[in-house]
Interface confidence: low
């Protein structure tokens, strides 16, 4: 299989991306070709290249290869967006684990198992040897990096800088040890690219040697990146098509994570008495189908043989013979004990939406004493007594311990958005519980707002139309990029946190996103000196119905002349009518020859009552919304500016008072814009910043 391999499978692809060398001493080689596959083959074989090829870019417009002796992790190089470019990086140079004996390992570990620094391969001090880079071409005996040029048993090794120890193996883990998955790996997005028998996986975007239906563009949320193992179809574990023409597909050897913490976006809400959605989270004990026929045990193969076993579907709670929905069917079901009826739906289980006497809370739920003990994302609450230290850290009074029993959802800190609990998951320290306010409860959670309550309507996308190009200090303005393209705005409210809108995240895969800071041009042209590009490490969704997201950056932004934070308003504050404010965005501007520059549109605050009248009484605003009208006809937010801020100034302080979300019209004369009122959610924002761990700079 190695002999006739199509080498493009050995590369990690970053679409619409190229590498720009800042260091002019770095060499590159180019040539006209027809396909990226041709570039890959030449890069892998280093054929006719005056350097070791670590990456290449395929220029689709010019049908040209650019081969590089560096990759995106090298110094003197930066990534840049470009529609016509696709960047391919040799996985061997960016992998930090080994496959098999590690013969292909080309990473940068340079310390042995016992912690001794490696001797450079080109040096004979302190140990003389015959492993010269010139004698082992293609084995990448660079610097003093651990290598296994002969494919020996112990894995990558090196001569050591200690005269007493000639050589020693390096402690580089097997990729199969590093990679782990939860449940059956449906949410696995790791980098395993070979099967359990060692066959290399076929790229998902290729149809050779095996034609298939799982096209990445057709299933954008399945994580079909490069040729990594995935589980898009509810199999017992991740798998891939292989490069072996005789083996269509095979499972991959990915172990189950030790703590088995599920990604919160993938966990269905667990219920025991009723069905939420399709009932994937149903964990009750109903064990007959709709007509009373008893269910067959999941761990039994009689009377019906099947592969829906507890071993194959680890997190689906296939206990006893209870109705479950492990495979995304329309509702919970089971195999039946009647040999003539293989499966049946348990449609007698009521729908949660219809069940009466459901849990609810009044006001902000500070007196809620129900016994729900699960967050909205399905995580089990952890005991209050284990979390008192954390609780004391963000409230300035002694909580009522008599209310904080067991792990029930509570509201000890007077949170405006209802009961919550700690989770025990370090990534999601706490979250709200799926309890609604009681029907007919109109107790305001904050006072002084002129409004009845109604949910927000969602219509068109928003972009700043007919705005004026801005060059003032707007260092807090963030361009959120999705697959290398601007998709939304955002506001940097803390070095590691960006406030934006829920609608900005079409995919669950955080690798799809980047935050660009310090730019004025949407493509970053002319902003090279000031631009910061940061990855996204977590999304924290706002309280139910808020449309807000706090986006955590993988590392803190560096505050300088071009990047700054913007202040938040005080919780529950109101700003006087006619206060002058501005909205910012890079969205479509109504101009034919759009220059891609950040625009600003000036608006003024309007009371909720008056705002409702301007919308011909078709909308009523609630305490979580704020309204601002344009000074200029047809000027205001429009498509593509979601997540961006409504910025107002009061007492010489600029702050983000609103967030642009899909609103009620796009730059329509006499139609003011309706924004999420940040003041209503300020406590939530502060609480997240205080309680969620962020990386240190």
């Amino acid at each position: 299989q190695r002999k006739r391999r199509n080498t493009i499978h050995e590369f990690k692809k970053s679409a619409k991306t190229t590498l720009i060398k800042i260091d002019p001493a770095l060499k590159i080689k180019t040539k006209k070709v027809n396909t990226a596959d041709q570039c890959a083959n030449r890069c892998t074989r280093n054929k006719g290249l005056p350097f070791t090829c670590k990456a290449f870019v395929f220029d689709k417009a010019r049908k040209q290869c650019l081969w590089f002796p560096f990759n995106s992790m090298s110094s003197g190089v930066k990534k840049e967006f470009g529609h016509e470019f696709d960047l391919y990086e040799n996985k061997d140079y960016i992998r930090n684990c080994i496959i098999g004996k590690g013969r292909s390992y080309k990473g940068t570990v340079s310390i042995t198992k016992s912690g001794i620094k490696c001797q450079p391969w080109s040096s004979m001090i302190p140990h003389e040897h015959s492993f010269l880079p010139s004698s082992y071409r293609g084995k990448d005996l660079q610097e003093n990096y651990c290598r296994n040029p002969r494919g020996e048993e112990g894995g990558p090794w090196c001569f050591t800088s200690n005269p007493e120890v000639r050589y020693e193996v390096c402690d580089i883990p097997q990729c199969s040890e590093v990679e782990c998955m939860t449940c059956n790996g449906e949410s696995y997005r790791g980098l395993m690219d070979h099967t359990e028998s060692g066959k290399i996986c076929q790229r998902w975007d290729h149809q050779t040697p095996h034609r298939h239906k799982f096209l990445p563009e057709r299933y954008p949320d399945k994580g079909f990146d490069d040729n990594y193992c995935r589980n898009p179809d509810g199999q017992p574990r991740p798998w891939c098509y292989t490069l072996d023409p005789h083996t269509r597909w095979e499972y991959c050897a990915i172990k189950t994570c030790a703590d088995n913490t599920m990604n919160d976006t993938d966990v269905p809400l667990e219920t025991t008495e009723c069905i939420q959605g399709q009932g994937e989270g149903y964990r009750g004990t109903v064990n007959t189908i709709w007509n009373g026929i008893p269910c067959q045990r999941w761990d039994s193969q009689y009377p019906h043989e099947h592969d829906m076993t507890p071993e194959n579907f680890k997190c689906k709670d296939l206990r006893e013979n209870y109705c479950r929905n492990p495979d995304g069917s329309e509702s919970p079901w089971c195999f039946t004990t009647d040999p003539n009826i293989r499966v049946g739906y348990c449609s007698q289980i009521p729908n949660c939406d219809m069940s009466h006497g459901q849990d609810c809370y009044r006001g902000n739920g500070k007196n809620y004493m129900g016994n729900l003990s699960q967050t909205r994302s399905g995580l089990t609450c952890s005991m209050w007594d284990k979390n008192m230290e954390d609780l004391h850290r963000h409230i300035f009074w002694e909580p009522d311990a008599s209310k904080l029993n067991e792990n029930y959802c509570r509201n000890p800190d007077d949170d405006a958005h209802g009961p919550w609990c700690y989770t025990g998951n370090p990534l999601i320290p706490w979250d709200y519980c799926p309890i609604s306010r009681c029907e007919g409860d109109t107790t305001p959670t904050i006072v002084n707002l002129d409004h009845p309550v109604i949910s927000c309507a969602k219509t068109k996308q928003l972009r700043v139309v007919n705005g004026i190009p801005t060059r003032t200090n707007i260092g807090w303005m963030v361009s959120l990029r999705y697959r290398n393209k601007h998709i939304c705005g955002g506001s940097l409210i803390k070095e590691s946190w960006v406030l934006t809108a829920r609608q900005c995240f079409p995919s669950r895969d955080l690798k799809d996103y980047e935050a660009w800071l310090g730019i004025h041009d949407v493509h970053g042209r002319g902003d090279e000196k000031c631009k910061q590009v940061l990855n996204v490490s977590q999304l924290v969704y706002g309280p139910e119905g808020s449309d807000l997201v706090l986006m955590k950056l993988a590392r803190p932004a560096v505050l300088d002349d071009f990047v700054s934070t913007i202040d938040l308003p005080n919780y529950g504050c109101t700003i006087p009518e006619k206060t002058s404010c501005s909205v910012y965005g890079w969205g479509y501007t109504g101009l034919i020859n759009y220059d891609g520059l950040l625009r600003v549109a000036h608006l003024y605050i309007m009371g909720n009552e008056k705002c409702s009248q301007h919308h011909r009484g078709k909308v009523t605003l609630n305490e979580s919304e704020i309204c601002a009208g344009a000074e200029k006809i047809g000027s205001g937010p429009c498509e593509g500016d979601y997540g961006g801020p409504l910025v107002c100034e009061q007492h010489k302080m600029r702050m983000v008072l609103g967030v642009i979300v899909p609103g009620r019209g796009c730059a329509i004369p006499n139609r003011p814009g309706i924004f999420v009122r940040v003041a209503y959610y300020a406590k939530w924002i502060h609480k997240i910043i205080l309680t969620y761990k962020v990386p240190q700079s």
């Epitope: 034609r211 298939h212 239906k213 799982f214 096209l215 057709r218 179809d233 509810g234 269509r248 597909w249 099947h306 829906m308 495979d327 995304g328 069917s329 329309e330 079901w333 293989r342 499966v343 739906y345």
Partner: antibody
Framework: VEESGGRLVTPGTPLTLTCTVS????????MGWVRQAPGKGLEYIGM?????RAWYATWAKGRFTISKTSPTVDLKITSPTTEDTATYFC????????????????WGQGTLVTVSS | QVLTQTPSPVSAAVGGTVTINCQGS????????FSWYQQKPGQPPKLLIY???TLASGVPSRFKGSGSGTQFTLTISGVQCADAATYYC?????????????FGGGTEVVVK
């Protein structure tokens, strides 16, 4: 794959056709229904996936209901009209992993439905 | 989405070649999501070709499929008496949140 239940019905009288499979695990294969009016071409009605979810051709939505309880797949014609007179075929779709297309690789002989007053 | 088959009917002598075209009103969701079926009187259709050019199991190699996008062709070379039948093309189109399947109107092949 064997269809049954075809008969003469009056307009508006609901009719359920049954497709019985043997040697096919319905938890691994999707099944589809296709019809053919006398002397006319094939017309796709809909299919039921391995997880029990049904999809329909745009024109067939509301007029037909597909369901399954292994080893049978049912097609219910909710309110037949004379235009529904046809031979109804039940067919297996090739396994998802063999091709990316919806392809009917195994067909029953069909069952004739006549709608007439 | 409409699939138009031409010509119909088509006749060929034993040993000759028959070409049937199928034109789509819009592109398929994937260039190759296309199949050909053979149906003889009183029988159900039989799969000949899928993915535009892949021969189904047990189908003689004289049947050949080609084309992509909106234009597809079935060629029968070295026609035999047993090939007298009606041939249907079938394409899969993107249609809202599901895939729509459509059949062509059929082409009758008469063997002389």
């Amino acid at each position: 794959v064997e269809e049954s239940g075809g008969r003469l019905v009056t307009p508006g009288t609901p009719l359920t056709l049954t497709c019985t499979v043997s040697g096919i695990d319905l938890s691994n294969y999707a099944m589809g229904w296709v019809r053919q009016a006398p002397g006319k071409g094939l017309e796709y009605i809909g299919m039921i996936g391995v997880n029990g979810r049904a999809w329909y051709a745009t024109w067939a939505k509301g007029r037909f209901t597909i369901s399954k309880t292994s080893p049978t797949v049912d097609l219910k014609i909710t309110s037949p009209t004379t235009e529904d007179t046809a031979t109804y075929f039940c067919a297996r779709l090739i396994d998802e992993r063999s091709t990316y297309s919806y392809v009917f690789d195994l067909w029953g002989q069909g069952t004739l439905v006549t709608v007439s007053s | 989405q409409v699939l138009t088959q031409t010509p119909s009917p088509v006749s060929a002598a034993v040993g000759g070649t028959v070409t049937i075209n199928c034109q789509g009103s819009q592109s398929l969701y994937n260039n190759n999501a296309f199949s050909w079926y053979q149906q003889k009187p009183g029988q159900p259709p039989k799969l000949l070709i899928y993915d535009a050019s892949t021969l189904a199991s047990g189908v003689p190699s004289r049947f050949k499929g080609s084309g992509s996008g909106t234009q597809f062709t079935l060629t029968i070379s070295g026609v035999q008496c047993a090939d007298a039948a009606t041939y249907y093309c079938q394409g899969e189109f993107s249609c809202g949140d599901v895939d729509c399947i459509a059949f062509g109107g059929g082409t009758e092949v008469v063997v002389k």
